[in-house]
Amino acid sequence: EPYTDSNVPEGDSVPEAHWTKLQHSLDTALRRARSAPTAPIAARVTGQTRNITVDPRLFKKRRLHSPRVLFSTQPPPTSSDTLDLDFQAHGTIPFNRTHRSKRSSTHPVFHMGEFSVCDSVSVWVGDKTTATDIKGKEVTVLAEVNINNSVFRQYFFETKCRASNPVESGCRGIDSKHWNSYCTTTHTFVKALTTDEKQAAWRFIRIDTACVCVLSRKATRRG
């Protein structure tokens, strides 16, 4: 599974019975696709409505989905109504559901006198239209999928640095006498629904996932 969970809102694994509205829609679509395999499912790409064939079977292989990717008819749920990003058994796509589960702490809680070395900001990104895939190729991200007249949006939970230098010398709390430092956004790859001209497919795309401190030792002078 090629993703880190730095800063990811966590959720408890829940029984298969807790299927989402999307899963039901997909099951219905899948049954229809079996009887009429050529019927395309309309998908809207970057706001333009086009007929793109989305095989509902794409949603059946749920092994590789990250809790950082969400398909939902509404904006991402909040923790009070499931921003635990609850994912189903085997860590499937965290679709919107009515199931509620405990939410664990999503990023370090700093106590008095404790500081973060680098400062990050996290948001649900719903305006992703292009991305870089795992092969370094620019791909089009399927922003919305229309299934059985329900429009599902693809959201990504992304974390990036707020500043490359939280303090003048670089990262916070680093001995600047001996070390050069700066904060940088690191990435991971998550499975996302993407499209080329005709076909929708799952691809690993790169998203921002953490803000880390990069250190390099300062050259020491020899007298």
Partner: antibody, heavy 122, light 107 residues
Amino acid sequence: QVQLKESGPGLVQPSQTLSLTCTVSGFSLTNNNVNWVRQATGRGLEWMGGVWAGGATDYNSALKSRLTITRDTSKSQVFLKMHSLQSEDTATYYCARDGGYSSSTLYAMDAWGQGTTVTVSA
Amino acid sequence: DIQMTQSPASLSASLGETVTIECRASEDIYNALAWYQQKPGKSPQLLIYNTDTLHTGVPSRFSGSGSGTQYSLKINSLQSEDVASYFCQHYFHYPRTFGGGTKLELK
């Protein structure tokens, strides 16, 4: 430079439909998100909805049933339509830009129009 | 929806004083918070984004801080031109919501 300008009728009859236009310059609608925010006299700011750079829309759930936001990228215009207006919809209506995830300011609204005042009254 | 609770609703301060305005989110917003200043009869203007980053042209007497659900805006050495209403707003996800605002006046 970046500019947004709201236009529309100053007076709307109760139960009628409000149509506002936000004309933008200095940036592209296909690279930025545009939001509508309103403010009743002496009150706070209320986010109404917005259109993403990609063309998708999101709405304030309390207004969703009466609100439609569209755009015409070739004219650099964003439109707000709200039906069944009542006196409590009397407010100054602003359009505001946010640069989206790829901008340094993320989704903070970094440029605002001057606002247009709408009165709902018979 | 995430609720943003701002306090105080109004405050009076003297020139040169330090003023702090608080904003509490109903849940974690991961530092996706902005502060706006609105002078009487004018449009709101972005002051601070990403919790603590000053927008272009904003004087350094303004600063933002916080994390999780608790955020604050601090104005050091209050100037007469700082008389305005201040609003916090989250952009963690849609729908965006604003705090109720704080009206800052001079004593």
